[in-house]
């Protein structure tokens, strides 16, 4: 499987909601010895490797923020503490994992990274992430709701969260 | 932060059986997964079990399987292992440690010490 | 299972020399591996996680690189609290398996 990220530039005003997805791509083995744990985290850009290095969320680290489950199915975190910093993290029936953060600041601009891990029994952990930039803006060059960057082109769009 | 106490350990005949308690401090132990890592005397670090955060999967290494139990109470912030037909080389500091998956041991507790002896 | 050997099995170094600790893997494990270090009566300390990467709070003077069946962990001037024993671990297959550990000893 691989992981796809619809949008690799987030550009938002300050105070607005965001919402950061990710896809999970391919062949998704649904036996009953597997399920997947996602997750977010801060990183920087590695000289080497994006997303190599893991910083909370808000404080919260990628242990607070996972969502664990079989394949393609719905979850989405469960305790109060991702809420209380705004945060919440979500996944579909289709693959489509995202994690959403409200009343953005400029501390919250920055490198943001999906993680994906299968887990099997007697089988090599798989790991996949993807990488995005959320830049959180103010003043009169602010625009008025999320301007999203599509991966594959430089054609951006406008989205409200 | 969260921090790990296990409790249970002491001297047990061989054949016998004990039951080894984690507790963890901190509102947010029912998302970590958890694994139980044992260390005999003098020796290396040993994996034991592990148990996801909501019970399921389970996995444990040969040398227990069949013998030991993971499990968890997670109203109780509590990790368990029941460790039945002990054999003298069960005799190890046993330790348990968060365990996320794609990621290490980065959480550990001061470990309890089981001695198998006659 | 995949079998981790650590060599030297014991390194005796003054305070201010390098440290070079290898660990060697019985198959590919990857970039997952990491290193710990433990001091006596306490448990494990993560230093290293993903081959390279320092875990939160580690000094700058521990290093690390590899990837597949060969791994570093070099200390470029060791401080007294350094002496202690070194694990290496690999998480690329179940079950987890550690190193032998090497000790890093005053001389």
């Known amino acids: 499987f691989k992981v796809a990220t619809p949008y690799s530039l987030y550009v938002c005003p300050e105070g607005q909601n965001v919402t950061l997805t990710c896809r999970l791509l391919g062949p998704v083995d649904k036996g009953h010895d597997v399920t997947f744990y996602k997750t977010w985290y801060r990183s920087s850009r590695g000289e080497v490797q994006t997303c190599s290095e893991r910083r909370p969320i808000r404080n919260l680290t990628f242990q607070d923020l996972h969502l664990h489950h079989g394949g393609h199915q719905a979850a989405n975190t469960s305790h109060d503490l991702a809420q209380r910093h705004g945060l919440e993290s979500a996944s579909d029936h289709h693959g489509n994992f995202s994690i959403t953060m409200r009343n953005l600041t400029l501390l919250d601009s920055g490198l943001y990274c999906c993680l994906v891990v299968e887990i099997r029994h007697h089988h090599s952990e798989h790991r996949v992430h993807g990488a995005m930039e959320l830049q959180v803006q103010t003043g009169k060059d602010a625009p008025s709701n999320c301007v999203v960057y599509p991966s594959s082109s430089q054609e951006s769009e406008n989205i409200t969260a | 932060q969260v921090q790990l106490v296990e409790s249970g350990g002491g001297l047990v005949k061989p054949g016998g059986s004990l039951r080894l308690s984690c507790a963890a401090s901190?509102?947010?132990?029912?998302?970590?997964?958890m694994s139980w890592i044992r260390q005999a005397p003098g020796k290396g670090l040993e994996w034991v079990s592990w148990?996801?955060?909501?019970?399921?999967?389970?996995y444990y290494a040969d040398s227990v399987k069949g013998r030991f139990t993971i499990s968890r109470d997670n109203a109780k912030n509590s990790l368990y292992l029941q460790m039945n037909s002990l054999r003298a080389e069960d005799t190890a500091v046993y330790y348990c440690?968060?365990?996320?998956?794609?990621?290490?041991?980065?959480?550990w507790g001061r470990g309890t010490l089981v001695t198998v002896s006659s | 299972e995949i079998v981790l050997t650590q060599s030297p099995a014991t390194l005796s170094l003054s305070p201010g020399e390098r440290a070079t600790l290898s660990c060697r893997a019985s198959?590919?494990?990857?970039?997952?591996l990491a290193w710990y270090q433990q001091k006596p009566g306490q448990a494990p300390r993560l230093l290293i996680y993903?081959?390279?990467n320092r875990a939160t709070g580690i000094p700058a003077r521990f290093s690390a690189s590899g990837s597949g069946t060969d791994f570093t962990l070099t200390i470029s001037s060791l401080e007294p609290e350094d002496f202690a024993v070194y694990y290496c671990?690999?998480?690329?297959?179940?079950?987890?398996?550690f190193g032998q550990g090497t000790k890093v000893e005053i001389k």
């Open positions: 148990i996801s955060n909501s019970g399921e999967p389970i």
């Open positions: 901190g509102e947010t132990f029912s998302e970590y997964y």
């Open positions: 440690a968060r365990d996320e998956p794609g990621w290490e041991f980065d959480l």
């Open positions: 671990q690999q998480r690329n297959n179940w079950p987890r398996t």
């Open positions: 993903d081959a390279s």
């Open positions: 198959q590919s494990v990857s970039s997952y």
